[in-house]
């Protein structure tokens, strides 16, 4: 029962993680305006990945897209690749924990084959989480070096001094929701590790049967493996539980729905 | 079409207050920040505050700030403002304008002419 | 406070001349997240109340007239009339848009000989 919880509450975590990650890739406020001495502001300008925007105070706000690839700073570049490399692992690593979930029958998938189904969408999540987090960072280590670069006033003008404000920008709320949703794809993509662990079959010794035919004493070799007669479609061994009872991890449970918001 | 109508002319003691109105009709009221100005006998054009009417939401120029206090009633799509401890300097003509892109002031009502007099 | 400078203070013109009038702010008033400039220019006839031109600097509103020009960027702005009609004898305000409190210059009248 716990590596189903496990294997469950991990496929959740990652799903809040990815769909979190998809959607600070997607939000605009990547980096807002720095309002450090002027709290109310006319003119308030924020950036994401793909555009930037102005939200005037009348209410009006335009954004523009990047159309050039060739004219962006190598480092925004970067960490669109980062997230989008994020996005696409997570969402196979999605598909795959959904084939690997032991509520889920398909077929008469193995153990075997979902801890590695489990294993394998586990790590797809950590790299996922670890490439949303490093996209992130390096967006919030380029803002802080930009941060301190710009001069907050510089003195232009011709014929007098006549003071120029320059706009500093600090970090917006996509660097947050990112930030929670690559832990939260990491953590889950642990979670399916751990889960991994306790799916797969372990090389357990079980009590030697003794059958008795008549007129021939045939015990069968320790090890709870049954001969392959050879007899049905189905020449794979597999282990006796004694009584034939299900464990509680063995019984079937139905996929619960869950809303995504 | 788009249009804001003010409240008539007011006489008014030094000290006492005065609230004056803007009704706005022809567009969605409460989608648009509301400005007022201020425009002595003569003299140039200065900002007062604004108001949006959608939440209340307002922002004052620091200089008015305490004196003036806008208001908005969407049921009767009118805002208000009141200007208190009046002397002879808040003698004026004061306008209501509705603020639209461009931090622009594209509508303007007719002006409501306070004479402050003992 | 940003500080609007208007010039001339007056303009005396003859009908069809072209006429050019200045506005000075203390501080920038081009934003650099869309490369516009947060002027906006009103003209206001005797007893009237003001009628926005031109905003953004150089964004004609509808319904006013080609012959009002808006150009400029940073702190220096102008508004050129380019055929003067008696319509337009006013007083032409600037305005910044850019920053709180929104401030006018002094105005700009013009006459008509």
């Known amino acids: 029962m716990a590596v189903t919880a496990c294997q469950g509450l991990g496929f959740v975590v990652s799903l809040i993680g990815i769909a979190g990650i998809i959607a600070a890739t997607c939000m605009d406020q990547w980096s807002t305006q720095d309002l450090y001495n002027n709290p109310v502001t006319a003119v308030f300008n924020y950036q994401g990945l793909w555009r930037s925007c102005v939200r005037e105070s009348s209410g009006f706000t335009e954004c523009r897209g990047y159309f050039t690839l060739l004219g962006l700073p190598a480092m925004l570049q970067a960490v669109r690749a980062l997230m989008i490399v994020g996005i696409v692992l997570g969402a196979i690593g999605l598909l795959v924990s959904i084939f690997a979930l032991k509520c889920i029958r398909i077929g008469s998938m193995e153990d075997s084959a979902k801890a590695n189904m489990t294993l394998t969408s586990g790590i797809m999540f950590i790299v996922s989480g670890l490439c949303a987090i490093a996209g992130v960072s390096v967006f919030a280590n380029m803002l802080v070096t930009n941060f301190w670069m710009s001069t907050a006033n510089m003195y232009t003008g011709m014929g007098g001094m006549v003071q120029t404000v320059q706009t500093r920008y600090t970090f917006g709320a996509a660097l947050f929701v990112g930030w929670v949703a690559g832990g939260l794809t990491l953590i889950g993509g642990v979670m399916m590790c751990i889960a991994c662990r306790g799916l797969a079959p372990e090389e357990t010794n079980y009590k030697a049967v003794s059958y008795h035919a008549s007129g021939h004493s045939v015990a069968y070799k320790p090890g709870g493996f049954k001969a392959s007669t050879g007899f049905g479609s189905n020449t794979k061994n597999k282990k006796i539980y004694d009584g034939g009872a299900r464990t509680e991890d063995e019984v079937q449970s139905y996929p619960s729905k869950h809303d995504y918001v | 079409q788009v249009q804001l109508q003010q409240s008539g002319a007011e006489l008014v003691r030094p000290g006492s207050s005065v609230k004056i109105s803007c009704k706005a009709s022809?567009?969605?009221?409460?989608?648009?920040?509301m400005n007022w100005v201020k425009q002595r006998p003569g003299q140039g054009l200065e900002w007062i505050g604004q108001?949006?009417?959608?939440?209340?939401?307002?922002t004052y120029n620091g200089k008015f700030k305490g004196q003036a206090t806008l208001t908005a009633d969407k049921s009767s799509s009118t805002v208000y403002m009141q200007l208190s401890s009046l002397t002879s300097e808040d003698s004026a003509v004061y306008f209501c304008?509705?603020?639209?892109?461009?931090?622009?002031?594209?509508?303007w009502g007719q002006g409501t002419s306070v004479t402050v007099s003992s | 406070d940003i500080v609007m400078t208007q010039s001339p203070s007056s303009l005396t013109v003859t009908a069809g001349e072209k006429v050019t009038m200045s506005c000075k702010s203390s501080?920038?008033?081009?934003?650099?997240?869309?490369?516009?400039?947060?002027l906006t220019w009103y003209q206001q006839n005797p007893g009237q109340p003001p009628k926005m031109l031109i905003y953004?600097?150089?964004t004609r509103e509808s319904g006013v007239p080609d012959r009002f020009t808006g150009s400029g960027s940073g702190i220096d702005f102008s508004l050129t009339i380019s055929s003067v009609q008696a319509e337009d004898l006013a007083l032409y305000y600037c305005?910044?848009?850019?920053?709180?409190?929104?401030?006018f210059g002094s105005g700009t009248k013009l006459e008509i000989k």
């Open positions: 304008a509705r603020f639209v892109k461009g931090n622009a002031m594209d509508y």
């Open positions: 022809g567009y969605a009221f409460s989608s648009y920040w």
């Open positions: 108001i949006y009417p959608g939440n209340g939401d307002t």
């Open positions: 501080q920038s008033l081009l934003n650099s997240g869309n490369q516009k400039n947060y």
């Open positions: 953004w600097a150089s």
């Open positions: 305005q910044n848009a850019y920053s709180y409190p929104f401030t």
